[in-house]
C-alpha cells in the first residue's frame, strides 16, 4: 500500500505562437482544478477506461479574472498535492491522465459550470520511494508542469511497496535471513510468506504461498522478464499460450530502453543509458531542451552541441536536482555550533547563537563573566554560555542588585512567623516548636529533640537564623 503524489507547478500558455485566450474574463471569473487518473502498466487505454490504480481531484484554485488586453498568464493553482492512495503493490509502470478543469463562477442557473480545458496523458516507469520526477506536458496551446512520486505507507517498503517492515525484536540485529529495512534501519523485514523462491524484487504476494508478478515479469516465481519484441514485429511469432511472453536470459532481454537507449544489467534490474535528448528510466521521456526552460530557480541551462540536444542545469547556491528543483537543506549539515539555531534564508545561511556564543557559526565562546560584575559582593560563575551570579546573603536577582526577601519562601515551619533581619531571617515559632526554622517539636515533658536551648533562651523564643 502507498500513495501516488502529484504536485502541479504551473498551467499556462506554452511557448510558441498562438497563445491561448485566458479561460476567465471579468464577466466570467473562474478557477481551476485538476483531476488525475492512474492505470497500471504502459497500456494506451482510452481516457474513459477505469482508473484501476485510482484517481483524485484537487481543491479549487483561487478565483481568477482576466486583465483586459493581457495575454493569458500562468493561472493561479490550487494549494497542496493530489494524492492517489493505492491498496496493492505499486506496479512500477503506469499510465496517467491529468485533466485541467475550469469552474466558471458567473451567474449560471443551477450553480457553477465546469468545462475541460486540457488533458495530458503519458506512460512512465517509476519506482516507489524514489525522488520527485519532474515533467512538462503540452495540450494544444497549453502547457502543464508537474512533479510526481510514489511512496509506500508503513509498514510497506521497497520499490513496489511489497516488502513489509516490523520493529526489531532484538535490539542488535534482525532474525535469520531477514534484512534491515532501509531507510528504517531500526526495523526488520517481516518474514516472507510468499511462495518459496518468489522473486523478492519482481514478485509479491497478498496471500501466503502465492507469487504475483510486477509489470514486466512473468513465470511461476516472477524471475522471467517479459519480452515484447516479438509482439511488436508483424512477422514475429504470436501464441495464445505465451501471449507473446518470451522467456529471456536477463532483464535486458528485448531491450526495455526506448529511443535507442542501451541497456545494461544491474544486480537488481537494468539501467538504460539514454541518447541525447531523452531521459527517464527507459529513455521514454524525450525532447526537453533549453528552449523549454527546464531549469528552475535561476538555474543556468546549457545545451549540447546543437539546439535540439539534451540539456544540463547548473544550479545556483541552495538548489540541486537535475532541474534545480530541489532546495538544499543546508541546515541538515548542522553548521551552527554550540546549539545555535540554523536559518536558511535562501541567499545565505544564518546562525542564531545561544547566549554566550558569537560568530557566523556561533563558534566563539564568549567569556561569560568578562565585564559582568555581580553587585553587593556577589561572585560570577561561568557555565553553559551564560553567566550566573552567586549572591551574598540578603541579595538576589541576575546581578545581585535586588535585596532578597528571605521570608518569601516561607522558611519557618509549623506555623512559625518569619521576620526579615539585616543578616538573614528570624523565625518566631508557634508554641510547641523550636529550632532555627521551627522544625523541631518540643517534647511534652519540656525536653526537646535537640540539645537544651542555650542559656537565656526559652524553647519557643525566636531563634535567629545565621
Amino acid at each position: 500500500a502507498g500513495v501516488f503524489e502529484l504536485q502541479i507547478h504551473s498551467f499556462g500558455p506554452g511557448p510558441g505562437p498562438g497563445a491561448p485566450r485566458s479561460p476567465c474574463s471579468a464577466r466570467l471569473p473562474c478557477r481551476l482544478f485538476f483531476r488525475v487518473c492512474l492505470k497500471p502498466g504502459l497500456s494506451e487505454e482510452a481516457a474513459e477506461s477505469p482508473c484501476a490504480l485510482g484517481a483524485a481531484l484537487s481543491a479549487r484554485g483561487p478565483v481568477y479574472t482576466e486583465q483586459p488586453g493581457a495575454p493569458a498568464p500562468d493561472l493561479p493553482l490550487p494549494d497542496g498535492l493530489l494524492q492517489v492512495p493505492f491498496r496493492d503493490a505499486w506496479p512500477g509502470t503506469f499510465s496517467f491522465i491529468i485533466e485541467t478543469w475550469r469552474e466558471e463562477l458567473g451567474d449560471q442557473i443551477g450553480g457553477p459550470a465546469w468545462s475541460l480545458l486540457a488533458r495530458v496523458a503519458g506512460r512512465r516507469r517509476l519506482a516507489a520511494g524514489g525522488p520527485w520526477a519532474r515533467d512538462i506536458q503540452r495540450a494544444g496551446a497549453w502547457e502543464l508542469r508537474f512533479s510526481y512520486r510514489a511512496r509506500c505507507e508503513p509498514p510497506a517498503v521497497g520499490t513496489a511497496c511489497t516488502r513489509l517492515c516490523r520493529p526489531r525484536s532484538a535490539p542488535s540485529r534482525c532474525g535469520p535471513g531477514l534484512r534491515p529495512c532501509a531507510p528504517l534501519e531500526d526495523e526488520c523485514e517481516a518474514p516472507l510468506v510468499c511462495r518459496a523462491g518468489c522473486s523478492p524484487e519482481h514478485g509479491f504476494c497478498e496471500q501466503p504461498g502465492e507469487c504475483r508478478c510486477l509489470e514486466g515479469w512473468t513465470g511461476p516465481l516472477c524471475t522471467v522478464p517479459v519480452s515484447t519484441s516479438s509482439c511488436l514485429s508483424p512477422r514475429g511469432p504470436s501464441s495464445a499460450t505465451t501471449g507473446c511472453l518470451v522467456p529471456g536470459p536477463g532483464p535486458c532481454d528485448g531491450n526495455p530502453c526506448a529511443n535507442g537507449g542501451s541497456c545494461s544489467e544491474t544486480p537488481r534490474s537494468f539501467e538504460c543509458t539514454c541518447p541525447r535528448g531523452f531521459y527517464g528510466l527507459r529513455c521514454e521521456v524525450s525532447g526537453v531542451t533549453c528552449a523549454d526552460g527546464p531549469c528552475f530557480n535561476g538555474g543556468l541551462c546549457v545545451g549540447g552541441a546543437d539546439p535540439d540536444s539534451a540539456y544540463i542545469c547548473h544550479c545556483p547556491p541552495g538548489f540541486q536536482g537535475s532541474n534545480c528543483e530541489k532546495r538544499v537543506d543546508r541546515c541538515s549539515l548542522q553548521p551552527c555550533r554550540n546549539g545555535g539555531l540554523c536559518l536558511d534564508l535562501g541567499h545565505a545561511l544564518r546562525c542564531r547563537c545561544r547566549a554566550g556564543f558569537a560568530g557566523p557559526r556561533c563558534e566563539h565562546d564568549l567569556d561569560d563573566c568578562a565585564g559582568r560584575a555581580c553587585a553587593n559582593g556577589g561572585t560570577c560563575v561561568e557555565g553553559g554560555g551564560a553567566h550566573r551570579c552567586s549572591c551574598a546573603l540578603g541579595f538576589g536577582g541576575r546581578d545581585c542588585r535586588e535585596r532578597a526577601d528571605p521570608c518569601a519562601a516561607r522558611p519557618c515551619a509549623h506555623g512559625g512567623r518569619c521576620y526579615a533581619h539585616f543578616s538573614g531571617l528570624v523565625c518566631a515559632c508557634a508554641p510547641g516548636y523550636m529550632g532555627a526554622r521551627c522544625e523541631f517539636p518540643v517534647h511534652p515533658d519540656g525536653a526537646s529533640a535537640l540539645p537544651a536551648a542555650p542559656p537565656g533562651l526559652r524553647p519557643g523564643d525566636p531563634q535567629r537564623y545565621l
Epitope: C290, N297, G298, N323
Partner: antibody, heavy 119, light 115 residues
Framework: QVQLVESGGGVVQPGRSLRLSCVAS????????MHWVRQAPGKGLEWVAI????????YYGDSVKGRFTISRDNSKNTLYLQMNSLRVEDTAVYYC????????????WGQGTLVTVSS | DIGMTQSPDSLAVSLGERATINCKSS????????????LSWYQQKPGQPPKLLIY???TRASGVPDRFSGSGSGTDFTLTISSLQAEDVAVYYC???????????FGQGTKVEIK
Amino acid sequence: QVQLVESGGGVVQPGRSLRLSCVASGFTFSNCGMHWVRQAPGKGLEWVAIIWYDGNIKYYGDSVKGRFTISRDNSKNTLYLQMNSLRVEDTAVYYCGRHDYGGNSFDYWGQGTLVTVSS
Amino acid sequence: DIGMTQSPDSLAVSLGERATINCKSSQNVLPNSNKKHYLSWYQQKPGQPPKLLIYLASTRASGVPDRFSGSGSGTDFTLTISSLQAEDVAVYYCQQYYSSPPEWTFGQGTKVEIK
C-alpha cells in the same frame, strides 16, 4: 552597496600575458556567478567568460577560448582573468559583472580597466 | 552563429517624446522556467559602465524609472522610453543568453540623442 573594482590593466605587447583582478564588496561574493565583459574602443559589448559561484563551472567566448582563464578566490572576494597570448584585437576596457540568476543577465558592473595590446 | 540586430543604429528624439528601439535575434530567445525570455536591455552613458534596465524582456531592474519598458517574445523585442528626458541620452544594448554552447550575446547598440 554592491561594488566591483577592476585592476591590472595596462599596455602589453602581443603574445604576452596579463592578469586582471576584480574585488567585490557589498554582497555575498561566494553566492554569485561572475562574468568578464569587454568593450573595444568605440565599439559594442562582448561577453568574455563566466565562472559559477563555486568556481567549478567556467565558460568562455569563442574569441578567447584556450587563451584566457577565469578564476576566483572566494576567501578574498576576488575574481581574476588570466590573459595569455594576447592579440591586438584584445585591446578593450574589461568589465567584471555580477550574474543575475533570475534574468540570466549582468545586474552590477565595475568601472572597467583598460587593456592595450600594442607592439 | 547567433546574432542580435538592433535598429535603428541611432535615434534623435525630442524631449518628452517617445523613443523606440528594436532588437531582433537570429534564433528564438530562450525562456526561463516560467517561460519569460532571457532578454535584457542596458544603458551606457559616455565614460561609464553599462547599467541593467530591463531583464526577462519586460521586468524593470530596481531603481529604473517607469518610463522605460520592455516587450516582445520569440525573436523580436522592443525597448520603449515613453517620455525622453535629457539624462536618457546614452547607448542602449539588448542582450540575450544562448545555451549551445553557452554565451551571452549583445546587439551592436543604439545611440539615443535629443533632437
